[in-house]
């Protein structure tokens, strides 16, 4: 969690002189309670906005907006503490709006906003606006909190942000996977414009289960510049296990900006549909059983094998 740049942050508006300060998230009104405290914020809204740094990088930010209740307690409002808690790491960042002049009632409701908290793709935040001074220990709470879930890098607007681009969001491999026969799977995808290697991770599952019955990893060497943006195809050899028919193919790139932590893309091939109606039983019995060409439990190809081509 951080603030966007360290440029001058503004909270003044017509009729109010205000300054934005860093906060320890522990306003001194906790320690020295006041008798008269303002009511809580009204209509707290958090939206996803995007902002450029002075260096030109684009980051997702939490746009926080709230209004004041139209009661006499605004006469005792000395400011607000904005707090953002990142749920998964319990990291908290606060800023304080310090009012340097007293608020007066006017015809339009007072409205405040702040758009400088940089948020991470796919993360969840609790945003709290606390009016200051905070209430005495048994007083009614004068804060409002809301949760804010930031979309991940698959989201169209997020894709072009600096953190998402750094993890490879602009690469669309357009994966196609097809079963050639019971033992071969063909994977096609588009290479990105970087000389970096890829890994194809194949995980196979039984029809209705989540425990894998086969795993195979295939390495694709870095393409040459003339192969950038071209389709690459790989044929993977499956382990011939009966019922091991649902295949998940994941492609992991190793771009220089994200190394082994780049966004992965995946595609799944479902098990073939079982026929709804049973096969008709012939009205004669064959005199011999047809011989199967291969055993259902073939053990000599545990590792799986593969070959690949780049197409221009």
């Amino acid at each position: 969690l951080r603030l966007l740049d360290h440029r001058a942050l503004v909270c003044s508006q017509p009729g109010l002189n205000c300054t934005v300060k860093n906060s320890t998230c522990l306003d001194d009104s906790w320690i020295h309670p006041r008798n008269l405290t303002p009511s809580s914020p009204k209509d707290l809204q958090i939206q996803l906005h995007f902002a450029h740094t002075q260096q030109g990088d684009l980051f997702p930010v939490a746009h926080i907006e709230w209004t004041l209740q139209t009661d006499a307690s605004i006469l005792y409002l000395e400011g607000a503490e904005l707090s953002v808690l990142q749920l998964n790491t319990n990291e908290r960042l606060c800023v304080k709006f310090q009012f340097l002049s007293m608020l007066q009632h006017h015809r339009k409701r007072w409205r405040f906003s702040f758009s400088h908290f940089v948020v991470d793709p796919g993360q969840e935040y609790e945003v709290t606006v606390h009016h200051l001074p905070k209430p005495i220990p048994d007083g009614d709470p004068n804060h409002q909190s809301k949760n804010f879930l930031v979309p991940d890098c698959e989201h169209a607007r997020m894709k072009v942000t600096t953190p998402c681009m750094s993890s490879g969001s602009l690469w669309d491999p357009n994966i196609t996977v097809e079963t050639l026969d019971t033992q071969h799977l063909r994977v096609d995808f588009t290479l990105w414009n970087e000389s970096t290697h890829y890994q194809i991770l194949l995980t196979s599952f039984p029809h209705m289960e989540n425990h894998s019955c086969f795993e195979h990893m295939h390495h694709i060497p870095a393409p040459r510049p003339e192969e950038f943006h071209q389709r690459s195809n790989v044929t993977l050899t499956l382990r011939n296990l009966k019922g091991c028919c649902r295949h998940q193919v994941q492609i992991q790139p190793f771009f220089s900006s994200c190394l082994n932590d780049c966004l992965r893309h995946s595609a799944t091939v479902s098990c073939p549909e079982m026929p709804d109606t049973p096969e008709p039983i012939p009205d004669y019995m064959p005199l011999w059983e047809p011989r199967s060409g291969s055993s259902d439990y073939k053990d000599d190809d545990d590792k799986g094998s593969s070959h690949h081509h780049h197409h221009h």
Partner: antibody, heavy 118, light 107 residues
Framework: EVQLVESGGGSVQPGGSLRLSCAAS????????MNWVRQAPGKGLEWVSI????????HYADSVKGRFTISRDNAKNSLYLQMNSLRDEDTAVYYC???????????WGQGTTVTVSS | DIQMTQSPSSLSASVGDRVTITCRAS??????LAWYQQKPGKFPELLIY???TLQSGVPSRFSGSGSGTDFTLTISSLQPEDVATYYC?????????FGPGTKVDIK
Amino acid sequence: EVQLVESGGGSVQPGGSLRLSCAASGFTFSSYSMNWVRQAPGKGLEWVSIISSRSSIIHYADSVKGRFTISRDNAKNSLYLQMNSLRDEDTAVYYCARPKVGGGMDVWGQGTTVTVSS
Amino acid sequence: DIQMTQSPSSLSASVGDRVTITCRASQGISNYLAWYQQKPGKFPELLIYAASTLQSGVPSRFSGSGSGTDFTLTISSLQPEDVATYYCQKYNRAPFTFGPGTKVDIK
């Protein structure tokens, strides 16, 4: 001293209810999200639920969704887990745990035992 | 939901040995991974967070590495007091799933 103390465990029949409590001391409870984690006898750890500092974010494991309710009272420095429609597989030691700033859970209670059996 | 797997499920090693436990996430979780040690009859204790940051008070023989989907906990020189079950946990976003655990004992 930073401390978490769970209570409210006991024996209950399938379909019954229990309410677990966790009393926190030694830190600013209202600044932290809080978790419940459980461990069935002889099994591994299972994350159960999390509640954010101001209760605006709550998540549950699929295995307890719709049956368990997490809540907190910051004025009392207390965390709760209301468990309804209990099943045999809910038998476990239940821990409350505080997340560390930066990730993971660095403060755990001693646990309270819940036994669901007919 | 993202699945967490650990290997091996158990291991025996001699005092002084280098021990390595691996944890794999079914999808990338960046470095949002923690490791815990749990001794029999005790509550778990945090060893490593953010995949590689040592929790204060934890001996330096413990170390963590990895990012994305593959993570490793290493005990550089196994000590008798390290007999325990070790769990990884992902916390990129809820649910904050634990791995199934690796039981470590002394040969």
